[in-house]
Amino acid sequence: YDFTNCDFEKIKAAYLSTISKDLITYMSGTKSTEFNNTVSCSNRPHCLTEIQSLTFNPTAGCASLAKEMFAMKTKAALAIWCPGYSETQINATQAMKKARKSKVTTNKCLEQVSQLQGLWRRFNRPLLKQQ
């Protein structure tokens, strides 16, 4: 999906008001210095592409984050403010949610959510030069 035409300011507002808090809750008890940020993004559409991938695509050691509150809210924001955000992707998320039996917070998942926090912070500061 091409995130170019999303309403970035409304997605940013949703992140600041609620998604960010859910990410913090998920990471509670973890030191902010525990994980290095290895995933980066260069502009808002790119950031959303990376956020979508890390949030909804299963990775080794972290089967799926799709059932977490921050993920459901991310999906809702993209569905509302990204025109034509594909039903295929929305339905794929539902399949992932059904496939997941239990919510186990592994160290790999914590690392992944730490990367997500970095991507969201970058999304909120689009004018900053890439390090």
């Epitope: 949703a14 008001s17 459901m72 809210k73 569905a79 509302i80 025109p83 929305i90």
Partner: antibody, heavy 121, light 111 residues
Framework: QEQLVQSGDEVKKPGASVKVSCKSS????????ISWVRQAPGQGLEWMGM????????NYAEKFQGRVTITADPSTTTTSMELSSLRSEDTAVYYC??????????????WGPGTPITVSS | QSAPIQPRSVSGSPGQSVTISCTGT?????????ISWYQQHPGKAPKLMIY???KRPSGVSDRFSGSKSGNTASLTISGLQAEDEADYYC???????????FGGGTQLTIV
């Protein structure tokens, strides 16, 4: 069973405001969006805006921006729509409608019975 | 953005088929597969009949079907019955600002 129950008929003077409520029951309030749609006498349907309880955000049609406010009280699973600076053209039946599940907010699979609002001096 | 165009009225005899068209633009109907159809009897709330172009909610008769070609969506009702007499509205997702646009409505008369 799943239903939306709306508040009763209203008669208002031009310039006044009106608030219509919509009580949800029989389904998980936070999993859906609630939209408001109006229908003037003998006319078609017009989408006004929606509220997504999961995010706590609203989205309004440009035509109604600044004049409509949609709010929710999750504790009572009630959504309200307030329309201000009423004029005679606002005379219509106002419906609340539930956006489809699984984030498919653009179609409406459950409707309230409608609340007639008359604006007359 | 303006409302998609529907014929004001169509008619058919019991047992026949009718098709109601809904013509929009590339910014709404042509741009997304997010088209729904609603049936409304006089004095009643609308009822969802078709969503996402051609999907039927549970409980809706398979006599109702939807399709799309370019900027035009269509609702076909086969084997017309007396209770099908109603107004029919198409609706399309129309981007993040307008979000949903309804067509002007079509009155179906069973003759």
């Amino acid at each position: 069973q799943e239903q939306l129950v709306q508040s009763g008929d209203e008669v208002k003077k031009p310039g006044a405001s009106v608030k219509v409520s919509c009580k949800s029951s029989g389904f998980t309030f936070g999993s859906y969006a609630i939209s408001w749609v109006r229908q003037a006498p003998g006319q078609g349907l017009e989408w006004m805006g929606m509220l997504v309880p999961l995010l706590g955000v609203t989205n309004y049609a440009e035509k109604f921006q600044g004049r409509v406010t949609i709010t929710a009280d999750p504790s009572t699973t009630t959504t309200s729509m307030e329309l201000s600076s009423l004029r005679s053209e606002d005379t219509a039946v106002y419906y609340c409608a539930r956006g489809g599940s699984n984030y498919l907010y653009w179609y409406f699979d459950l409707w309230g019975p409608g609340t007639p609002i008359t604006v007359s001096s | 953005q303006s409302a998609p165009i529907q014929p004001r009225s169509v008619s058919g005899s019991p047992g026949q088929s009718v098709t109601i068209s809904c013509t929009g633009t590339s910014s709404d109907i042509g741009g997304y597969n997010r088209i729904s159809w609603y049936q409304q009897h006089p004095g009643k709330a609308p009822k969802l009949m078709i969503y996402d172009v051609s999907k039927r909610p549970s409980g809706v008769s398979d006599r109702f079907s939807g399709s799309k070609s370019g900027n035009t969506a269509s609702l076909t009702i086969s084997g017309l019955q007396a209770e099908d007499e109603a107004d029919y509205y198409c609706s399309s997702y129309a981007g993040t600002d307008t979000f949903v646009l309804f067509g002007g409505g079509t009155q179906l008369t069973i003759v």
